[in-house]
């Protein structure tokens, strides 16, 4: 299963003032799900890792990057079926002999505990409970991410109601 998806809109201005400019809103695009400061989009089909990476690009997004254990837990809490796996934006760099995020940074040893081999053509996926490596050619669902974007709307104060 995957989570229900609702519209995301977070008011980041604590004190509204009487002005013709609406408070700044952080918005996820339609169909995307807000999780903390990110917007996530769960695929409804399966692909090898490379195709998943490319498909996120068509949505002006990237495969999911996980910053720490807390973010991993938050994401795993959205996966309601233990049998479903999702590619994330982490694969093994043979030249550097290390796990590398698609933004170019390397996996720090205390970020994620990956079960499985660290070798050529290995990519990383998450399930409800764990983080695994698997051949990048394996077909799986995947998760895309975008950063929340700031939107300013000029409207009358009445429309805040």
């Amino acid at each position: 299963q995957k989570p229900s998806i609702g519209k995301c809109s977070v008011d980041i201005q604590q004190n509204r003032t009487k002005t013709t400019e609406r408070p700044d809103l952080l918005n996820c695009p339609i169909y995307w799900q807000q999780v903390q400061e990110k917007c996530l989009l769960f695929s409804h089909t399966v692909n090898p890792w490379n195709n998943s990476l490319a498909d996120c690009s068509t949505k002006e997004s990237s495969l999911l990057l996980i910053q720490d254990k807390d973010e991993l837990t938050r994401t795993q809490n959205l996966i309601h079926d233990k049998a479903i796996s999702f590619w994330i934006g982490l694969n093994f760099s043979l030249s550097e002999k290390n796990w590398k995020w698609i933004n170019g940074s390397f996996l720090s040893s205390n970020d994620l505990k990956i079960t499985g081999d660290a070798k050529e053509n290995s990519c990383v996926y998450i399930s409800q409970t764990s983080v695994y490596s698997e051949y990048c050619s394996t077909e799986m669902k995947w998760i895309c991410q975008k950063e929340l974007t700031l939107v300013r709307n000029k409207v009358s104060p009445d429309s805040w109601l």
Epitope: Q1, S4, G6, Y31, S43, H44, N47, D55, H80, E139
Partner: antibody, heavy 120, light 107 residues
Framework: QVQLVQSGAEVKKPGASVKVSCKAS????????MNWVRQAPGQNLEWIGL????????YYNQKFKDRVTLTVDTSISTAYMELSRLRSDDTAVYYC?????????????WGQGTTVTVSS | DIQLTQSPSFLSASVGDRVTITCKAS??????VVWYQQKPGKAPKLLID???IRHTGVPSRFSGSGSGTEFTLTISSLQPEDFADYFC?????????FGGGTKLEIK
């Protein structure tokens, strides 16, 4: 325009297998995931599984995982659903249906349906 | 599995009538709900996605609404070609499920 044309009705005996085809036209066959759905008499529609024609990757409803095989032949833009070890409760109309978007689970085009009857 | 319960199962109405069909989910599905129309012996046709977004080419008399667990499909002014079966579907989970359908008949 997008068209999904399915093979004709089948009558099978319990324990046998059936293979239903779905020929696609009017769009890039490898660009859209194909799903299979069935409707047994007096029952709700039931989702069976999907196949990505570009890669051959599949994902199945656990209920059918052991008995169904989804395949494609991209050279003739055709998807196939094979169901084995047929039982009488597999009697149903089987539909192929195109997934409209990689990130949403709606079906924007359907085949006309193939009636499969399982009877001894 | 998420169950979808449609009501009514049968509906008799006249050309020009406004009709509403309801789909209730056994748990929260957000807005990941779809509506289809199906005529006898024909393939289902997509009407509404994401609870309220009309598919390309669908007449404006068809509208969808709702979120969470309760959804409606409304036809504002019935036309002769609208008499058909209608069913809902959820994709909030990867095990897609469907409602039992509503048969809309001419009164």
């Amino acid at each position: 325009q997008v068209q999904l044309v399915q093979s004709g009705a089948e009558v099978k005996k319990p324990g046998a297998s059936v293979k239903v085809s779905c020929k696609a036209s009017g769009y890039s066959f490898t660009g859209y995931t194909m799903n299979w759905v069935r409707q047994a008499p007096g029952q709700n529609l039931e989702w069976i599984g999907l196949i990505n024609p570009n890669t051959g990757g599949t994902y199945y409803n656990q209920k059918f995982k052991d008995r169904v095989t989804l395949t494609v032949d991209t050279s003739i833009s055709t998807a196939y659903m094979e169901l084995s070890r047929l039982r009488s409760d597999d009697t149903a109309v089987y539909y192929c249906a195109r997934l409209g978007d990689n990130y949403r689970g709606y079906f924007d085009s359907w085949g006309q349906g193939t009636t499969v009857t399982v009877s001894s | 599995d998420i169950q979808l319960t449609q009501s009514p199962s049968f509906l008799s109405a006249s050309v020009g009538d406004r009709v509403t069909i309801t789909c209730k989910a056994s748990q929260d599905v957000g807005t990941a709900v779809v509506w289809y129309q199906q005529k006898p012996g024909k393939a289902p046709k997509l009407l509404i996605d994401w609870a309220s977004i009309r598919h390309t080419g669908v007449p404006s008399r068809f509208s969808g609404s709702g979120s969470g667990t309760e959804f409606t499909l409304t036809i504002s002014s019935l036309q002769p070609e609208d008499f058909a079966d209608y069913f809902c579907q959820q994709y909030s989970t990867y095990l897609y499920t469907f409602g039992g359908g509503t048969k809309l008949e001419i009164k």
